[in-house]
Amino acid sequence: SGTTNTVAAYNLTWKSTNFKTILEWEPKPVNQVYTVQISTKSGDWKSKCFYTTDTECDLTDEIVKDVKQTYLARVFSYPAGNVESTGSAGEPLYENSPEFTPYLETNLGQPTIQSFEQVGTKVNVTVEDERTLVRRNNTFLSLRDVFGKDLIYTLYYWKSSSSGKKTAKTNTNEFLIDVDKGENYCFSVQAVIPSRTVNRKSTDSPVECMGQEKGEFREI
C-alpha cells in the first residue's frame, strides 16, 4: 500500500512559554509529510500545519482560546514521493501527544525588572507585566491578567558589596523593600506559581543593580 514507507511520528513534545505553544516531534521526514490535529477532550479534531515537512507546529492560536482546557494533539504521517508501491493507501499513521493543559503547564518566561526607584531607605522594584498571546475582547492579556493571584514574584536582592541575599515576595508586580542608606543593591526576580506541581518557577531575571540606568534615585 502507499503507506509502506511512512514512519509514525515519535517523541511528541509540547514546548510552551507564556502560552506561546509549539508541538515538536521526530523524525525529519523522508518521502513523507505531516499534518497535525488538535482537540480538546470534548471538541473536534482540527487540522493545522497541513502537509508540512517541518517537525514542529505552532498551536498557540488554538490553545489560547481557553488556556484552562486540556488539549491533545496528533501528528499524521502521509506518504509523499518515492514510496515502495503505489496503490490505495489505508488509514494514515498517526501518533498522539501527551495531554497538555496550558494554564497548569506553560513555562513561565524569564521576567524582566522594569524599573526601581529609591526614596530614602525604601526601594520600589517593578516587574514588567509581560504580554501573552491570550486574547480577551480583541486585546492581548498580560501574564498577571491571565494568572491573577496565582502568580507571585520573588525578589532576590543583595548589597553590591556583599554576597548575602535577601528575599521578598509579592502577588502584584511591585515590591517595596527596606535598604540601608548609602548602599547600592542588586536585584533579580523570579516568577512563581506556588499552586503548581510542575513548571512552578521561571528562570531568574537578568540582574539589575543600583547606580545603573534602570533606576531612579531620590535621596530624602
Epitope: 473536534d44 514510496v83 494514515p92
Partner: antibody, heavy 117, light 106 residues
C-alpha cells in the same frame, strides 16, 4: 454517505450581492475544513480558500480577499461563499470540496454564477 | 505563491500510446496532487502525495517527481483516460493549481 450539495445556478447583474451555499451531510460537518474552488469558463481551477466550520477560521487566497467572503452555519451544516458587489469577472463555476487526505475526495456538484448586465 | 506550470497544454495521442504530463513548480514542493476532470463534472482526485494512486485508479497511471518537477504518466491510454489533468500543490498557502493539460484523442 458523504455528500456536498450546492445551491442552484445564479444569474445576477454587476453590483448585486450573492450568497451561494454548500450543504454537507453524512459526516461530522464541523470537523473538516471546507475548500472553495473557482473555475472560470474554459479555464483551470483556482483555490479560493477554506473555512473550518467549528470556529469559522479561514485561510483565504489573498487574490480573493477583497472579492469574496467565506462563512458557515453550523446548525444546518452549510458553508457559504458570498459577494457584496458582483463583477462580470466573477462569472464562473464554484465548487466546494471537503479537505481530505488521500483517496477521500468529496466535491459539490458546482454552482454556476453568471454576472451580466 | 507557488506557480505551477503544466506542459504541454494539450496532448494529442491515440489509445494505447504512452502519455507524459509535466508540472513544474516555481519553488520546491513536498506535497503534490493530480486531479482528473471531464466536461460537465467536478474534478476528481487521481494521484495524491506525488505518487499514490487514489482509490479505484488503474495501475497504468503513475506519479513521480520531487522538488520542482513532477510527472503524471499513463503507460497505455484507454478511451476513458481522455480528459483534463490538473496538478495541485499543498506545500504552502495559498494552495495552487496548474493550468491543466488536456489529453485528447488524436
Amino acid at each position: 454517505e458523504v455528500q456536498l450539495v450546492q445551491s442552484g445556478a445564479e444569474v445576477k447583474k454587476p453590483g448585486e450581492s450573492l450568497k451561494i451555499s454548500c450543504k454537507g451531510s453524512g459526516y461530522s460537518f464541523t470537523s473538516y475544513w471546507m475548500n472553495w474552488v473557482r473555475q472560470m469558463p474554459g479555464k483551470g481551477l483556482e483555490w479560493m480558500g477554506m473555512i473550518y466550520p467549528a470556529d469559522s477560521e479561514t485561510r483565504l487566497n489573498q487574490k480573493f480577499k477583497d472579492q469574496a467572503t467565506l462563512s458557515v452555519d453550523k446548525s444546518i451544516s452549510t458553508a457559504y461563499l458570498q459577494w457584496s458587489s458582483l463583477k462580470a469577472s466573477d462569472t464562473a463555476m464554484y465548487y466546494c470540496a471537503r479537505e481530505d487526505y488521500g483517496s477521500s475526495d468529496y466535491w459539490g456538484q458546482g454552482t454556476t454564477v453568471t454576472v451580466s448586465s | 505563491e507557488i506557480v505551477l506550470t503544466q506542459s504541454p497544454a494539450t496532448l494529442s495521442l491515440s489509445p494505447g500510446e504512452r502519455a507524459t504530463l509535466s508540472c513544474s513548480a516555481s519553488s520546491s514542493v513536498s506535497y503534490m496532487n493530480w486531479y482528473q476532470q471531464k466536461p460537465g463534472q467536478a474534478p476528481r482526485i487521481w494521484i495524491y502525495g506525488i505518487s499514490n494512486l487514489a482509490s479505484g485508479i488503474p495501475a497504468r497511471f503513475s506519479g513521480s517527481g520531487s522538488g520542482t518537477d513532477f510527472t503524471l504518466t499513463i503507460s497505455s491510454l484507454e478511451p476513458e483516460d481522455f480528459a483534463v489533468y490538473y496538478c495541485q500543490q499543498k506545500s504552502s498557502f495559498p494552495w495552487t493549481f496548474g493550468g491543466g493539460t488536456k489529453v485528447e484523442i488524436k
